[in-house]
């Protein structure tokens, strides 16, 4: 009879065992072990016992002895069981974002690790048990459905296996993937909301604010703002779940013409954008031509208004004929004419949007210099040791100086309070003389003498 | 000054139809027009502008689905595919004024016509 | 764009009565307002151009004010020849997209 000590064994992957053969007779006439496995031979004293080292154990394994007694032959098995954890447990690649209110397939894969019946694969959330099921095929897999919710944000999922060899008398062996850490996200259906101006003028400052609600989370959201190739750079306000990008933009010459406007949300693997037009001119405010800004009295003057080659104009409130860009009018400079503004109002449609602009210039008028009974009478009488103020206005552009002088020395005081006395009387040469000539007029002052009863 | 539309008619739904706008006493060429809709039980709605040279904006409803060119003495709007909710009064009006006081000009419907009636049924 | 907001939607007055609409931009038009009275089966009848002045052959009994963004109309006296609706446009954009009229509002006389 042969036996065979241990009959059963439990070792790991690469691992040695001693196996001992015996035979119930004395002088077997053979006694021996058959395996594939690499064996050494441990001598013993006696013949009835024999005891093998048996190395590098890779897979399960079903060693015989056998022996020849002078009864007759028999055999005894052990048998080897081969344990040894996964070589890989990996979750399926995921893109980390995840929508909110997405199915989410999580798919674990695992190589190796025996033996199976003692091998669970386990899908966990945290610590949370989402799956536990035998590890079945190889690769074997194990997958779960998860609807994506809000608060799964920043979650971790891992798989894990288990090798339970407790039953056996060793330990519970685990092995955990490499954690999947979920973001989750909304982004709403709805593009975010653009507010610019329609239409800017060349080397002006506008502002534009991009704005979504319903976000999260709204810190990782990403807010891209750009007029035409130009990024802009946004002050970002946050909400609970809303953000409010403001940036200033600056537009030149080389920007004019019709340019897009995109704000551009990124969160996640998802985005919305927005695009707008902003129409970019260059409107200089008109031109008023004098033919001359100074102009004698008399003096033809043609006063023009020039404008942008669009733009509608009216001089001074009456529309350019036929409507255009130019309008121009004839006069004849008078001395009402002094002082006069010329207004040039100009009327620019943009993209639909209308922009005024407007210049005015004053016509100088020269003239006189001029004096006449309204402003200087030529006779004054008053009675003797009164206070009176003789009056004399000259007129004329440039202001006229003026003397008033009688026998060509002695002047009559324009303008000041006197007490009157008999020196005053007499004929009086007024002289008025500016850049634009000289005109006199003849004053005479007569005294009343006081009458005494 | 006077301005006239004509071309409203009863039409099935996605037959095109043009409505015409007749000015008279005063020149296009000097002059922004605008075509105006109130369909019944409904407010004044804007559909678009033609302006003196021939540029055309319109309210963000009606674009695609309205559209308005010139002539020297005519303005015309096309409904290109009208649907019955299309049904209502066309008015197109003078749209273009200028303040003396200020000399600007702005869009003022200083001038109406009497409206003409499209009725879109099946 | 310049949305204009018109309130009251309706408004019900007695012959003699005075009513107030008012008009808001959504953003400032300066001055560049015009109020029309719409009756139906006929063209509307502008009242009042830019902001304030009384269009010609309109009655007295007609006010408009304000400037940038708040408008009113004011009607005083009120007659019955005064129901229908009352619409503010502003004259500052006709760009693509805009809106120009307010959204009316029905003047009803007892």
């Known amino acids: 009879q042969t036996s065979v000590s241990p009959s059963k064994v439990i070792l790991p992957r690469g691992g040695s065992v001693l196996v001992t053969c015996s035979t119930s007779c004395d002088q077997p006439k053979l006694l021996g072990i058959e395996t594939p496995l690499p064996k050494k031979e441990l001598l013993l004293p006696g013949n009835n016992r024999k005891v093998y080292e048996l190395s590098n154990v890779q897979e399960d394994s079903q060693p015989m002895c056998y022996s020849n007694c002078p009864d007759g032959q028999s055999t005894a098995k052990t048998f080897l069981t081969v344990y040894w954890t996964p070589e890989r447990v990996e979750l399926a690649p995921l893109p980390s974002w995840q929508p909110v209110g997405k199915n989410l397939t999580l798919r674990c894969q695992v190589e190796g690790g025996a033996p199976r019946a003692n091998l669970t694969v386990v899908l966990l959330r945290g610590e949370k048990e989402l799956k536990r099921e035998p590890a079945v095929g190889e690769p074997a897999e194990v997958t779960t459905t998860v609807l994506v919710r809000r608060d799964h944000h920043g979650a971790n999922f891992s798989c894990r296996t288990e090798l339970d060899l407790r039953p056996q008398g060793l330990e519970l062996f685990e092995n955990t993937s490499a954690p999947y850490q979920l973001q989750t996200f909304v982004l709403p259906a709805t593009p975010p909301q653009l507010v610019s101006p329609r239409v800017l003028e060349v080397d002006t400052q506008g502002t534009v604010v991009c704005s979504l609600d319903g976000l999260f989370p709204v810190s990782e959201a990403q807010v891209h703002l750009a007029l035409g190739d130009q990024r802009l750079n946004p002050t970002v306000t946050y909400g609970n779940d809303s953000f409010s990008a403001k940036a200033s933009v600056s537009v030149t010459a080389e920007d004019e013409g019709t340019q897009r406007l995109t704000c551009a949300v990124i969160l996640g693997n998802q985005s919305q954008e927005t695009l707008q037009t902003v129409t970019i001119y260059s409107f200089p405010a008109p031109n008023v031509i004098l033919t001359k800004p100074e102009v004698s009295e008399g003096t033809e003057v043609t006063v023009k208004c020039e404008a942008h080659p669009r733009a509608k104009v009216t001089l001074n409130g009456v529309p350019a004929q036929p409507l255009g860009p130019r309008a121009q009018l004839l006069l004849k400079a008078t001395p009402e004419d002094n002082g006069r503004s010329f207004s040039c109002s100009a009327t620019l449609e943009v993209a639909g949007q209308l922009i005024h602009k407007n210049q005015t210039r004053e016509l100088r008028v020269l003239y006189g210099p001029r004096l006449d009974e309204r402003d200087c009478p030529g006779n004054w009488t008053w009675p003797e040791n009164s206070q009176q103020t003789p009056m004399c206005q000259a007129w004329g552009n440039p202001l006229p100086e003026l003397k008033c002088l009688k026998d060509g020395t002695f002047p009559l005081p324009i303008g000041e309070s006197v007490t009157v006395t008999r020196d005053l009387e007499g004929t009086y040469l007024c002289r008025a003389r500016s850049t634009q000539g000289e005109v006199t007029r003849k004053v005479t002052v007569n005294v009343l003498s006081p009458r005494y009863e | 000054q006077s301005v006239e539309e004509s071309g409203g008619r009863l039409v099935t739904p996605g037959t095109p139809l043009t409505l015409t706008c007749t000015a008279s006493?005063?020149?296009?060429?000097?002059?922004?027009m605008s075509w105006v809709r109130q369909a019944p039980g409904k407010g004044l709605e804007w559909i678009g502008i033609i302006s003196d040279s021939g540029t055309t904006y319109y309210a963000s409803w009606a674009k695609g689905r309205f559209t308005i060119s010139k002539t020297s003495t005519t303005v015309d709007l096309k409904i290109t595919s009208p649907t019955t909710e299309d049904t209502a009064t066309y008015f197109c009006a003078r749209d273009w004024s200028y303040d003396s006081s200020s000399g600007y000009y702005y869009y003022d419907m200083d001038l109406w016509g009497p409206g003409t009636l499209v009725t879109v049924s099946a | 764009g310049y949305d204009m907001t018109q309130t009251p939607a309706s408004v019900e007055v007695a012959v003699g009565g005075t009513v107030t609409i008012k008009c808001q931009a959504s953003q400032s038009i300066n001055s560049w307002l015009v109020w029309f009275q719409h009756k139906p089966g006929q063209p509307p009848k502008r009242l009042i151009y830019?902001?304030?002045t009384l269009a010609s052959g309109v009655s007295s009994r007609f006010k408009g004010s304000g400037s940038g963004t708040h408008f009113t109309l004011t009607i005083s006296g009120v007659e019955s020849a005064d129901a229908a609706t009352y619409y503010c446009q502003q004259g500052y954009s006709r760009s693509d997209g805009e809106h120009v009229f307010g959204g009316g509002t029905e003047v009803v006389v007892k």
């Open positions: 830019k902001a304030s």
């Open positions: 006493g005063f020149s296009l060429s000097n002059y922004y």
